[in-house]
């Protein structure tokens, strides 16, 4: 069978080979399409409701004034010329529709390096057959499930027209130290290769590089955090980040009702001050970051203090990690 592709809504003429150019003609067209139960026979006499869908022209060709999805199928013509020689024509008709230009919607203006980000959703409306959407980054194809690339696809079919809407949501994890202004685009490739790809406008989000979080250090004075009753303990929260974050204090996992400050002074220590202390640094650009916790304890007269330098040690004296 000869393959014929026809655009939806356009007219189509199929030649009946070997048919006399003018009546009288001995020919018969047989159709097996989405409009027929099995084979439908059409003769030059025509007439009836089929004339609006397909009719035989005076020269024996079959004329379809506006091809639709239901016209996909097999078309056969059997003709006899004046000398009684029989000729058969056999066509396999497939239809297509080119969608409008695809678009990227819900596109991100900024991506964060090192974490998965949604770049945007590519939408193509009105294709047949469905076709495919694919993504490009800086002119190179993106392959789903490779190098931090993931794509969520959805295909819907219009209940009346039968045309397809495709959606493709792109997620990427930009590499740290990579291109600060990557260029993404999406293109629609037709299911029937009778048309070139259709490409969206490019988008160029910025890539934001989060500053690697340096640890929040908690320094205790006196070293070790053990002090005689009535003594003073000074806790200092050191954060290398700029600009300086807000520092709040916690005791035994509960926030202390104090104004933000990088230094906490516990004067005239009493039993009620014993416990586990930590500080929390809150950055504007990312969430809170908590220091390691230290224990503050009272040394009764005659007791040995903990080993010097045991802040953050495990199980050394009375000062330990929470």
């Amino acid at each position: 069978a000869q393959n014929i592709t026809a655009r939806i809504g356009e007219p189509l003429v199929l030649k009946c080979k070997g048919a006399p150019k003018k009546p009288p003609q001995r020919l018969e067209w047989k159709l097996n399409t989405g409009r027929t139960e099995a084979w439908k026979v059409l003769s030059p006499q025509g007439g009836g409701p089929w004339d609006s869908v397909a009719r035989v022209l005076p020269n024996g060709s079959l004329f379809l004034p506006a091809v639709g999805i239901q016209d996909e199928g097999i078309f056969r013509c059997q003709a006899m010329n004046r000398n009684g020689k029989e000729t058969k024509s056999n066509y396999r008709v497939r239809v297509y529709q080119i969608p409008g230009k695809p678009e990227i919607v819900d596109s991100a203006s900024e991506l964060t390096a090192g974490v998965p980000n949604k770049v945007g959703t590519c939408v193509s409306e009105g294709s047949y057959p469905a076709g495919t959407l694919s993504w490009h980054l800086d002119g190179k194809p993106l392959v789903p499930n490779e190098k931090g690339v993931s794509v969520k696809e959805q295909t819907r079919r219009h209940p009346e027209t039968g045309l397809f809407t495709l959606q493709s949501e792109l997620m990427v994890t930009p590499a740290r130290g990579g291109d600060p202004r990557p260029t993404f685009s999406c293109s629609f490739s037709p299911g029937l290769p009778r048309h070139r790809a259709l490409r969206t406008a490019p988008i160029q989000p910025r890539v934001w590089e989060p500053v690697p979080l340096e640890e929040v250090q908690l320094v205790v004075e006196p070293e070790g955090g053990a002090v005689a009753p009535g003594g003073t303990v000074t806790l200092t929260c050191e954060v290398p980040a700029q600009p300086s974050p807000q520092i709040h204090w916690m005791k035994d996992g509960v926030p202390l009702p104090l104004p933000p400050s990088p230094v906490l002074i516990l004067p005239e220590i009493g039993p009620q001050d014993q416990g586990t202390y930590s500080c929390v640094a809150t950055h504007s650009s990312h969430g809170p970051q908590e220091s390691r916790a230290v224990s503050i304890s009272i040394i009764e007269p005659g007791e040995e203090g903990p080993t010097a330098g045991s802040v953050g040690g495990s199980g050394l004296g009375t000062l330990a990690l929470a």
Epitope: G139, P141, P193, R199, A201
Partner: antibody
Framework: QVQLQQSGPELVKPGTSVRISCKAS????????IHWVKQRPGQGLEWIGW????????NYHEKFKGKASLTADKSSSTAYMQLSSLTSEDSAVYFC????????WGQGTLVTVSA | NIMMTQSPSSLAVSAGEKVTMSCKSS????????????LAWYQQKPGQSPKLLIY???TRESGVPDRFTGSGSGTDFTLTISSVQAEDLAVYYC????????FGGGTKLEIK
């Protein structure tokens, strides 16, 4: 019908710059990529870069970064390519073309760099 | 970048003969996401702009005579002219448009 009309030939001195134009007609200028391609005399084709006139985002072949600069004027439906610090190596015919693959081409602009 | 290599660099045939020319890419131009080969062929006649003949490796551009046929997949492609005409005198370029854009060096077709 789609047409890309390029500016005329240029004879320029080494070390100077040149700007060549590509006027589009017969379609919506802001909806399609315009590419630029270089062809040295008797040689093959070399892709330079593209511009999307709708949002003037550009993309360049690594080799032409710093050499070529692509711009577009929506009001006149014209794309431009400026070539800077010209040497004899830049003597070539430069084509503008639309979409990928390149179905529509300008007629080409000959740039001759000579002292 | 993907390198494109064409062979032969030139050939001379008589009108009516069949001609084939080859194009090889340094890596596959078949895109797994849609199973299409991003390979095009152009014809450039002397003093003219290139003209698109074939895209998706085998789809003829509208208006291109059916004596021009593209075939192949992955890295190996062929352009065939079934019956060469005098007006086919030109240089033929292959072009990959999957990963950025690169062209082959061209095959010059001469008519004996």
């Amino acid at each position: 019908q789609v047409q890309l009309q390029q500016s005329g030939p240029e004879l320029v001195k080494p070390g100077t710059s040149v700007r060549i134009s590509c006027k589009a007609s017969g379609y919506t200028f802001t909806s399609y990529y315009i590419h630029w391609v270089k062809q040295r005399p008797g040689q093959g084709l070399e892709w330079i870069g593209w511009i999307y006139p709708g949002n003037v985002i550009t993309n360049y072949h690594e080799k032409f970064k710093g050499k070529a600069s692509l711009t577009a004027d929506k009001s006149s439906s014209t794309a431009y390519m400026q070539l800077s610090s010209l040497t004899s190596e830049d003597s070539a015919v430069y084509f503008c073309a639309r979409e990928d693959p390149f179905a529509y081409w300008g007629q080409g602009t000959l740039v001759t760099v000579s002292a | 970048n993907i390198m494109m290599t064409q062979s032969p660099s030139s050939l001379a045939v008589s009108a009516g003969e069949k001609v084939t020319m080859s194009c090889k890419s340094s890596q596959s131009v078949l895109y797994s996401s849609n199973q299409k080969n991003y390979l095009a062929w152009y014809q450039q006649k002397p003093g003219q702009s290139p003209k698109l003949l074939i895209y998706w490796a085998s789809t003829r551009e509208s208006g291109v005579p059916d004596r021009f046929t593209g075939s192949g997949s992955g890295t190996d492609f062929t352009l065939t002219i079934s019956s060469v005409q005098a007006e086919d005198l030109a240089v033929y370029y292959c072009h990959q448009y999957l990963s950025s854009y690169t062209f082959g060096g061209g095959t010059k077709l001469e008519i004996k």
